[in-house]
Each structure stands twice: as C-alpha cells, then as structure tokens.
C-alpha cells in the first residue's frame, strides 16, 4: 500500500456516501515520506468496511427509510494517517467538483462538443475517519466544499468548536467527558501522584490537557508528563519507560490518554526492560477492551483500568460477517489480502502475496476462529444510519409527498443536509437514543474495564464499572481482591501527629517532608507550627495551647532542679 496506487471499495446508488476507514496500519516512521501503509487491520479496517457495505444493504431494503432511494458508497483507506487521508479526501472532492461542473454543463470535450461521459456521482457526506488528528485534517478540507462529516470514534474536544469545524458531527462524546471519568477514578482510589503519558496528536494532547486541568482542581499532582507517537521506534518507548521508572515507587499509576498502539508500544517496552507489574496503567478509550493492544503482552497489561465507550456488540453484524469467504466476497477489494494476513496463508491466484506465505489457505478456514467484534462497531453503524436519517428528513422536507429524489435534491446541498443532520434523532443500533447537541456531539456513557488474569495464562477484560453523565460507579471488590491490594500512588505519606508538611522548593504540592514542631509549638495548620504564648504549653494532641497552671512553692517543698545552659 504505497502512495502510487490506492484501492477503493464502491457500491452503486442514487446517493453516494464517502467513508474513511483505517484498512491498514499507519506508515512506520521510515515509510511516512512515501505514505506506505502498514499491515491490514481487521477490527478497525475490514470489519468497518463490511459494516458499511452491509448497513447500506439493510437501509436500502428498509421500506420506511429513504423509500425509492438507493444509498451507495465509496470507501477509502485512511491508514490512520493524515497525509494518506487527505490524499483520499481530495479524491472525494475531485469527484464532487467534476460532478457539479457536469450539472452546470461545464464539462466539454476538447473539440468543443458537449460530453456524454458521466463521471462518478458526488459524495454527499463522509463517514469517519477514526483518528481525531486525521479527522481534523479531513474536516478542514471537507468544510470548504460544504460536505458534512460524521465521525464514529474521533473524540477530541477541539472538534466541538463549530467556528472551526462547522461540518463535523459525531455519534460519540467529546473527550472532556472521559478525561473527567479518568480523574474520578484517580480520586476514588486516593491516587494523588501519577505519571501522565499521551499520544502525540490531537486526541492525546487535548485529552491529556483536560485531564491535567481537572486533576489540578482536584489536588492530584502529575509527577511528569510525557508524549510519544504511536509509530515511534522501540528506542523511544524504552526511553519513555525508563523516565516513568524514575518516578517509582511514588507514581505507580500512569494515566495514558493514548491511542491503542501507543499503549501496545509501552507494554512491549515493559517486556524488554523487565518492568511487568511495576505500573498500573489507566487508559483512555483508545485502549478500551482491544485485544490487538494486549495480544502477546498480557502479563504487562494486567491490572490496567480502561475507559470504553458504551457500545454493546451488534449481533446482526456478526451473523453477516462470519459467513464471508474470499472466493465469494469480491466487493471488498481488501478482503483477500486480509484473509491471507489473518490466516497466514496464500490464496491461489494472488501472486503478490506468494513471497509472504508458504502454505496455501485451507478451504475450511472460517472467521469464526478467534473472532472479536470491533468495539466501536455500534458507533460505525450509528454514524451510517445518522447520514441515512439526515437524508431521509431532508427528502421529506424538500420533496413532500414524493418518493425518491426530487429536483430540489439535485444536487444535494451540503448546507441543508448539515441542518437536517443536526436535527436528526433516532434509536441507535443498541437501543439508545442518537442525537446531536449544538456542537454536533453525542452524550457520554462509558464502561470501566479492568484487564485481569482470570486463570493460568488466561487473561480478559471485565466490566468493573460505569461513568454516566458525571456519575462514577465502581465494583471495587472486582478490581481489588482485598482492600490492602489497592495500589498506592502518592508522593508523600501523611505526617504524624505534631508534624507539619514542608514542601521543598520547586516540588509539587503533593510532595513534602514531615517536620516536627518545636517543644513549645502546636500545629496551627498542616504547613505551620506556631509558638504558644508565654505561660501556655501545647496540648497533648498538639492542636492548641493550654495555660500552664501556676504552682506556688511552699516551705518544705523540695528544691527545684536547675539546668545549666550547657546542659542539653
């Protein structure tokens, strides 16, 4: 997958919706300049392509939704990379521009005669891409041409700004909410001193900024904050891990506002450096409950607490997807490449893969083996349905009493479509209400996951809580088998009775040394000792002073002991 030739998946229709999915991993650092993408992806790639194709089939066969109008699509690969996604978005735009010029009769042949050639239909809207950084770049281009964009996993807070990203909407909440959820978890377990890591790029940067702001307000200190690219080399991850280690044993919790592949990079570095079990990772929804993050590095991931957008599996998608086979699935141009990669075998008639795999694919192979549905599948499908309902409402309003596309919808006006989309509300694939606020955002509901060793060499994610509209619920007994097992992540222990906190110059407020008050002093507040007034003495609990009772000497009392100044 280099920049020379890009594969596209097409499905014909009266209205064409564009989609950007990360069919392949992002280019590695050394391949970025040539935009050569990495290996094919199943959950984030192939499953999403198939979800688009099959969801459109379902919509097209639903007599109540867009009757007499067929939705088609053009799916392109973003490779989770801005440069690739922009290149692909330009292709969407180019199709739209040529089509609109045709509508206005501007396309003429070289000899001056008019053309009978029909180019592709324009893209009315775009679904995706997954990454916030990439979505921002794509939106910057799409909004110039009034093309609405509906994202299914780009959660950056920046995208809520409608002055900057007018044509952007999403079926997921803004990251401000999961940053709050992460802070609430940190607070719950009295972790007052944590390290912070984020993925370079908009998702990680804005999310971590929110996490740090909220932490400061709650009296949580950040030992140090680090950033790294998901595709950074081993050496960069090793260096980052060493830096995190320098904050042990105080900052055992590492809050990671990270993409899944950043977390994987950290886990791999933990293995290399012999640091399994030294940290507790608190991960954002980039990690969620993804097995491609932890596979092969489960020991390093054990104990991890992650945030996952609430989205149950979609059963009807599995019913469709698990029956797919390479010999019959020709509409997905990446499917054969994926099949070979998934089963590490060679399909007959695909010479480009010959060098990679020696064994031929067995005909008994099935996707049912080790199948895991993409954790964001529900959002992908909801995004597609949002576009369909938006178009449906627009058709009802512009073409009353007319089944199909009336002239008022030819060509589709992106401004009117955006208006219609913003007003859309419907019951989503999981039974929840899908609606958009004035920023084009959806409400936030999260599940809290915990990665655990369930048995000998068997690891899994379990649901240990939820965060819904500001309320955190956690099953503490499920996370920690005993109260004493709760990990401590504090810089300094509380001071003993009669001691005050002395914060060293340049240190954060969570780090102090405990100093006892002098003999004649009491603890005025946690940072100050104060001397008792003449004639009074500190109380036993050192919280104040009591008057010293005056004792008068009488004849016959033993003489008092005197101490020289030299006596200590």
């Amino acid at each position: 997958q280099s920049s020379e030739r890009r594969v596209v998946a097409h499905m014909p229709g009266d209205i064409i919706i564009g989609a950007l999915f990360s069919v392949h991993h992002q280019p590695t650092v050394d391949k970025v300049h040539e935009r050569k993408c990495g290996a094919v992806r199943e959950q984030y790639g192939i499953q999403r392509v198939e979800a688009m194709l099959h969801t459109l089939e379902r919509i097209n066969s639903d007599p109540t939704l867009l009757p007499n109008i067929t939705l088609g699509c053009e799916i392109r690969d973003s490779c989770w990379h801005s440069a690739v996604a922009l290149e692909q978005s330009i292709e969407f735009i180019r199709d739209s521009l040529i089509s609109s010029e045709e509508e206005e009769g501007l396309v003429r042949c070289v000899d001056g005669s008019s053309s009978s050639f029909r180019s592709k239909k324009p893209i009315v809207g775009v679904i995706g891409p997954g990454s916030s950084s990439v979505a921002i770049q794509v939106q910057n281009l799409l909004q110039l041409f009034n093309i609405p964009q509906i994202a299914y996993s780009a959660t950056s807070m920046d995208l809520s700004d409608k002055t900057l990203f007018k044509y952007f909407m999403r079926v997921v909440p803004s990251d401000a909410q999961q940053a709050r959820a992460m802070v609430d978890i940190v607070k719950r377990y009295n972790w007052t001193y944590v390290s912070a890591v984020h993925t370079e790029g908009n998702y990680g940067e804005s999310g971590m900024e929110a996490f740090k702001d909220m932490s400061a307000k709650e009296g949580i200190c950040i030992a140090h904050s680090y950033k790294i690219y998901s595709n950074a080399g081993e050496q960069s991850f090793d260096k980052l891990l060493k830096k995190l280690t320098s904050h042990l044993p105080k900052a055992r919790v590492v809050a990671c506002f990270c993409e899944g592949m950043t977390v994987r990079g950290l886990l791999m570095a933990m293995r290399r450096l012999g640091l399994a079990g030294e940290f507790l990772l608190l991960g954002s929804d980039g990690w969620a409950d993804r097995y491609d993050v932890t596979d092969g590095y489960q020991r390093e991931a054990v104990g991890g607490i992650t945030i996952k957008l609430q989205s149950p599996d979609v059963k009807w998608f599995d019913d469709y997807y698990l029956k797919l086979r390479p010999e019959t699935n020709h509409r997905n141009p990446w499917f054969q490449e994926f099949w070979q990669h998934r089963f590490q075998c060679r399909l007959e008639g695909f010479p480009q893969e010959n060098s990679k795999y020696n064994k031929t694919c067995d005909s008994s192979l099935t996707l049912k083996t080790h199948h895991v549905q993409d954790s964001k599948m529900g959002f992908v499908i909801n995004a597609i349905y949002s576009m369909a309902y938006g178009l449906h409402n627009m058709q009802m309003s512009l073409c009353p009493g007319y089944a199909g596309l009336c002239d008022a919808m030819k060509p589709i006006d992106g401004r009117k479509l955006l208006e219609s989309l913003m007003k859309t509300n419907f019951t989503g694939v999981s039974g929840d209400m899908i609606l958009f606020d004035e920023n084009g955002d959806s409400p936030g509901r999260y599940e809290i996951m915990n990665f655990k060793e369930m048995g000998k060499d068997y690891f899994d994610y379990i649901n240990v809580g939820s965060w819904d509209n500001g309320e955190l619920k956690m099953d503490d007994d499920e996370v920690w088998s005993k109260k004493s097992n709760i990990i401590r992540s504090v810089c300094s222990e509380p001071c003993e009775k009669g001691q005050i906190k002395v914060i060293r110059k340049g240190e954060v407020s969570c780090c102090w040394t405990c100093t006892p008050c002098k003999e004649n002093e009491y603890v005025f507040d946690e940072y100050t000792c104060k001397a008792c007034q003449l004639g009074s003495w500190p109380t036993d609990d050192l919280t104040g002073c009591d008057l010293i009772p005056v004792q008068y000497l009488r004849w016959g009392d033993p003489e008092p002991d005197y101490k020289d100044d030299d006596d200590k």
Epitope: K239, L241, S246, P249, R271, L273, G274, E278
Partner: antibody, heavy 117, light 110 residues
C-alpha cells in the same frame, strides 16, 4: 547510607546457604537491590535483582537455584545445591532506581562463600 | 540474550598515557552503559553511568562515550592509582540475561 553482606562461610557441596544484606539510611521500597558475585581471580557475575516492589529477575544460569527476598531492612539470597563453582565473594549492590536494571551506586564489601568437600 | 563483550582483556599503559577500553552490546541498549573500577580486595566503584555521565567524585580524566551497541571508556593522563580492573555493565534489562557485566579489562600502569 550503607549496605553490608553477611552469612558467607565454608560449606560442603549440596548444602543450602542464605546470605543477608542489611541496609541502613534508605528504604528498600525506593531502590532495587542486586546480588553480584566474583570468583577468586575472575570477573563480576550478576546473579539477580529484587525491585522495590518485590519483583525478582535472575540471570538465566541462576534461575531455580538462587532466590532473593526482602524485609524492610534486609535482602536475603537463598542458595541451594551449591557446588565448588559457587565459591566466590558475594556482593550486594543498590541500584539507582526502584525497578529495572540501571547502575549500581552503593556496594557492600562482600561476603566470602567457600564450597569445598 | 543480551551480552556485553569487553575488549581488551588486559592493557599496559605508561603513566600520563591514554587507555581506551571498548564494550560491545549484542543489541541496542541506547545509552544505558555504565563503567566500574575495581581494585584488588575492594568492591567495584561506579565511574560512568548512562554512557557518558561522570559519577560524583570521579576525576574528569575518565570519559565515557558511545551509544546503541558500541561504548568506550577512555582514561587520559593515566596515574598509578588508575591501575585496576574495569568493567562495563548494561543498564537496559534484567530479563533473560546471563550477565549484565562485560568480562573486565585489567589496566596495568608502568
């Protein structure tokens, strides 16, 4: 801040032996501790490490025969199935960080273990 | 397994001369190489950490350099007190290794 090894003595092959490293002036929660040995006239040979958290790693040749453990002020090295090849001065050394292997800033004087029949 | 190969095993140097000791790691250890000096009957003493940083109280005639897999300890203006055995040590990982130290280099000062 100091570390001091003890427990080295003359033993016969096959006898188990436990060495102790006593530390003062710092907390074992904050530093990893290493065991290193040196046979007479030979180079330094790393045996293993115990982190502040209690996690342990051993040299591949030492796995199964050597076990490190700790209390609040001591680190023990339990040795089993000793042979004459295990005759050496055993050092305890403090690592710079609480976990991972880094560099050794504080060494004990060593304790001599002699295995002979 | 990660192995540290140290050369030479022994070197003779005149007072005031320069001695160079090399250490090669079998894999990239970034800059996590330390150097120790050990005199007879004494425990080793840290000279250099993180490839080039001088440990506290160590004279500036000791210099560490290198990164990745190749590391060097250079002693310039050698003094009689520098007669000792020098060891390199990887500070990369304790996992799956036979030894974190190199084989040692004996420096004889004439």
């Amino acid at each position: 801040q100091s570390v001091e090894e003890s427990g080295g003595r003359l033993v016969t092959p096959g006898t188990p032996l436990t060495l102790t490293c006593t530390v003062s002036g710092f907390s074992l929660n904050n530093y990893a501790m290493n065991w290193i040995r040196q046979a007479p006239g030979k180079g330094l040979e790393w045996i293993g490490i115990i982190y502040g958290s209690g996690s342990t790693y051993y040299a591949s040749w030492a796995k199964g025969r050597f076990t490190a453990s700790k209390t609040s002020t001591t680190v023990d090295l339990k040795m089993t199935s000793l042979t004459t090849e295990d005759t050496a001065t055993y050092f305890c050394a403090r690592d710079e960080l609480a976990a991972g292997i880094n560099y050794f800033t504080l060494w004990g004087q060593g304790t001599l273990v002699t295995v002979s029949s | 397994a990660l192995v540290m190969t140290q050369t030479p095993a022994s070197v003779e140097v005149a007072v005031g001369g320069t001695v160079t000791i090399k250490c090669q790691a079998s894999q990239n250890i970034i800059d996590w190489c330390s150097w120790y000096q050990q005199k007879l009957g004494q425990p080793p003493k840290l000279l250099i950490y993180e490839a080039s940083k001088l440990a506290s109280g160590v004279p500036s005639r000791f210099k560490g350099s290198g990164s990745g897999t190749q590391f060097t300890l250079t002693i310039s203006g050698v003094e009689c007190a520098d007669a000792a055995t020098y060891y390199c040590q990887q500070g990369y990982s304790p996992s799956g290794v036979d030894n974190v130290f190199g084989g040692g280099t004996e420096v004889v000062v004439k």
